[in-house]
């Protein structure tokens, strides 16, 4: 913490301007009034403060607003945002997308994924839901940031907004996030024709259940291996060889290349070797001929 001293009269600060860059840390602490700083935050980013000086300014604001900064201050943080921790940001209430844009621009090129994720979370909470304007802002200024939201927050996305989400925005989404987004996407695109529907739903398929994957196999979609490999393991394992062949169409030969990667590896182990042989790809590891498969979990449930 900065040690407290009295401000020399000649150093008294009446406005935030460039002269402050010549102040030592202790002089800034003693001479800058926190309320003045907050009122003139829009000037701070234009002044080339050192990181040490920014630490002092942050300390000032922290003292003035122990419960979290008001949005009027947050909007003008500029490079001072780089000094914020996720714990600081958690105290904020942000509703303005202009504020979000300004801070996303500042964070670009800096290792601030935790801070940005917390900021986006606060915006969603502040606005009450993940509306179209928020999604548009995220996709424009922070591709991939959508996936920094928790499944709980993503559940506030109305299906009507899903169309604004681009494939690259979902790149870093995990299975639990896609579990939430997939049903919304299915609803959003339900009135589209087969091929158009597949193009739209493809990025969300990591959250699809087996029944939906089976249904796709009947629609001549020719799913590429990249999409197939993103399907949930639980959705792939129950598929038959015939269903996978229909689902992949001409891409089926890619199974050979991916035979040691999950979920292909796990799916192969569940198939009869005879059935795998019908593909003519030389896939090995299926259940040998004449073997019976006993599902002990089912038997236990019945006993």
């Amino acid at each position: 913490d900065v040690e407290r001293t009295t401000c020399p009269p000649e150093k008294e600060v009446h406005e935030i301007d460039e002269s402050l860059i010549f102040y030592k840390k202790r002089e800034l602490e003693a001479c800058v009034d926190a309320a003045l700083l907050a009122a003139q935050m829009d000037r701070v980013d234009a002044i080339p403060f050192t990181y040490e000086q920014l630490d002092v300014l942050k300390h000032k604001l922290d003292e003035l607003y122990p419960q979290g900064y008001p949005e009027s201050v947050i909007r003008h943080l500029g490079h001072l945002f780089l000094k914020m921790s996720p714990e600081d940001i958690r105290k904020w209430n942000v509703t303005s997308l202009e504020t979000l844009k300004a801070l996303l621009k500042v964070s670009k090129g800096h290792e601030m994924s935790a801070q940005v994720a917390t900021l986006i979370d606060r915006v969603v909470v502040g606005r009450g839901q993940l509306d179209k304007d928020t999604v548009d802002t995220l996709t424009a200024f922070c591709p991939g940031c959508l996936c920094s939201l928790s499944p709980e927050r993503l559940s506030s996305v109305p299906p009507s907004v899903i169309g604004a989400v681009r494939p690259q925005d979902l790149d870093t989404c995990g299975p639990r996030q896609l579990d939430v987004l997939y049903p919304k996407a299915r609803l959003a695109f339900q009135n589209m024709s087969g091929s158009e529907y597949f193009v739209k739903i493809r990025p969300f398929l990591g959250g699809a259940p087996t029944e939906d994957v089976k249904a796709l196999s009947q629609q001549n979609v020719s799913m590429d291996l990249a999409t197939f490999m993103k399907l949930r393991r639980e959705a792939v394992l129950p598929l038959t060889v015939a269903e996978v062949q229909k689902l992949l169409g001409p891409h089926v030969e890619g199974l050979k290349v991916e035979e040691q990667h999950s979920p292909v590896r796990d799916w192969i182990l569940k198939q009869r070797q005879d059935d795998l042989d019908t593909l003519g790809l030389g896939l090995q590891g299926g259940i040998p001929n004449g073997y019976l498969i006993l599902d002990l979990s089912v038997r236990e449930a019945l006993s």
Epitope: D171, A226, G254, V257
Partner: antibody
Amino acid sequence: EVQLQQSGPELVKPGASVKIPCKASGYTFTDYNMDWVKQSHGKGLEWIGDINPNTDDTIYNQKFNGKATLTVDKSSSTAYMELRSLTSEDTAVYYCSRRLIGTGYFDVWGTGTTVTVSS
Amino acid sequence: QIVLTQSPAIMSASPGEKVTLTCSASSSVISTYLCWYRQKPGSSPELWIYSTSNLASGVPARFSGSGSGTSYSLTISSMEAEDAASYFCHQWSNYPYTFGGGTKLGMK
């Protein structure tokens, strides 16, 4: 433009480890596996292994089991290869290369990182 | 593992000459799963031919590829100066993926 950017040359001591980054840009990171290849004067090109960025699922050439560890960071579209217990035999150029999932050819190669092991 | 043997290891050709590089596999390779890379000194390898006979983007039409089973080849119908480089064959029909030792092609 599709690019795989690797770090500069590394000079390391025997027994040490090195972690080589490969930063991908210009394409959907999760649609491609990332493979790693060693090129040395004595042995030509050798496939080390690959990683699926969706599942972090890895496959290694048995020869490099215990020598190489492949990881990815989806949030930054970066793949990494860590080489440990280095000996002079590990002196080589190491390339990352992308492979469209479902194919086996490497359509884009990284810039290469030269690793020199010397005391 | 499948061993790929390339021949010749080193060769040079005159401008306009037809050049054939061969790649022999120790056991059968599915033709879809064989490709060729070109590498110039000081540069990374680049995909040249995939699935035995398909030219990668930007590869001149004077190049062609053919073969099946254990025998594959890359042919240049009319050698040009810019074709001087090392060429490697590569299979992914079986794990581990393997490469040929390369043919270093020079200009006479």
